[in-house]
């Protein structure tokens, strides 16, 4: 390990179309594949009317977005799907919003999801 | 060094079958989902198929639900796509692709294609 | 399904040319949106995944940006080996679908 790196060895899985995909709902995904690439956790998940619905989490290839993020952060503006990756075992248990705004002061808006 | 080499395409009669084969080498077969790919003469990529590494789950394109299934033999490294009631619109170069470990799940390496002809 | 809209359908570019192609998405999916390159005959070959990662042993020359519905690839400086078609493909859905595709040809 490279210090001062969080390696993925595992992130939390989850798919909203498991049922129709035949995959489990939610689980451990373990992270693997070529050694001198970087591996990932991310999660994507919409905003119904202020409910948090979560569509997918799970492993991300290696990605200079995601590096040496220990938290899951999405940080763009509204967007319609909100999307975060981060490194580190689990890292996207948790994840937030967070806009980066260019005059007013950003407030964070952690999110947890529930279990179903 | 990863490869892919499909056979068993060829000339077939409207109504008929076909099977595919897909044999890889390279890497660890059972840890990448697999996929199908076509391209009809002339024109853009159609996804067709994919199957986990363990085979257990499978996706297909709503134009050959129903007509086509994806499987694997993990013991053979070899990837197999059966068509049955082939229509003259599933003319085209098929080919075999490997997806990446972890999304958004890219086809990192493919194989050079089988044609499939299907002609009265 | 996930329609995946290619613009143009082809162009005319000459060596040294910054080409542009953008792929449009009918619905948003995030960055899970792929970038491949195929010449006549030919597989086709990765170049760019998660709408901006470049894929190991691809020239820096080709970029990627854009999320949600609008991505872009560009060719920052149009080489002989990079007159090909270019398609985008889309993995948010499970029925993955490609774009139409944009021929890139010589002026």
């Known amino acids: 390990a490279i210090l001062g790196r969080s390696e993925t060895q595992e992130c939390l899985f989850f798919n909203a179309n498991w049922e129709k995909d035949r995959t489990n709902q939610t689980g451990v995904e373990p992270c693997y594949g070529d050694k001198d690439k970087r591996r990932h956790c991310f999660a994507t998940w919409k905003n119904i009317s202020g409910s948090i619905e979560i569509v997918k989490q799970g492993c991300w290839l290696d990605d200079i977005n995601c590096y040496d993020r220990t938290d899951c952060v999405e940080k763009k503006d509204s967007p319609e799907v909100y999307f975060c990756c981060c490194e580190g075992n689990m890292c996207n248990e948790k994840f937030s919003y967070f806009p980066e705004m260019e005059v007013t002061q950003p407030t964070s808006n952690p999110v947890t999801p529930k279990p179903p | 060094e990863v490869q892919l080499l499909e056979s068993g395409g060829g000339l077939v009669q409207p109504g008929g079958s076909l099977r595919l084969s897909c044999a890889a080498s390279g890497f660890t077969f059972t840890d990448y989902a697999m996929s199908w790919v076509r391209q009809a003469p002339g024109k853009g990529l159609e996804w067709v198929s994919s199957?986990?590494?363990?085979?257990?789950?499978?996706y297909y394109a709503d134009s050959v639900k129903g007509r086509f299934t994806i499987s694997r033999d993990n013991s053979k490294n070899t990837l197999y796509l059966q068509m049955n009631s082939l229509r003259a619109e599933d003319t085209a170069v098929y080919y075999c692709?490997?997806?990446?470990?972890?999304?958004?799940?890219?086809?990192?390496?493919w194989g050079q294609g089988t044609l499939v002809t299907v002609s009265s | 399904d996930i329609q995946m809209t290619q613009s143009p359908s082809s162009l005319s570019a000459s060596v040294g040319d910054r080409v542009t192609i953008t792929c449009r998405a009918s619905q948003s999916i995030s960055r899970f949106l792929n970038w491949y390159q195929q010449k006549p005959g030919k597989a086709p070959k990765l170049l760019i995944y998660?709408?901006?990662i470049l894929q190991g042993g691809v020239p820096s020359r080709f970029s990627g940006s854009g999320s949600g519905t609008d991505f872009t690839l560009t060719i920052s400086s149009l080489q002989p080996e990079d007159f090909a078609t270019y398609y985008c493909?889309?993995?948010?859905?499970?029925?993955?679908?490609f774009g139409g595709g944009t021929k890139v040809e010589i002026k």
């Open positions: 493909q889309q993995t948010y859905s499970t029925q993955w679908t």
């Open positions: 199957v986990s590494g363990s085979g257990s789950s499978t």
């Open positions: 998660g709408a901006s």
């Open positions: 692709a490997r997806g990446s470990i972890g999304a958004p799940w890219p086809l990192d390496y």
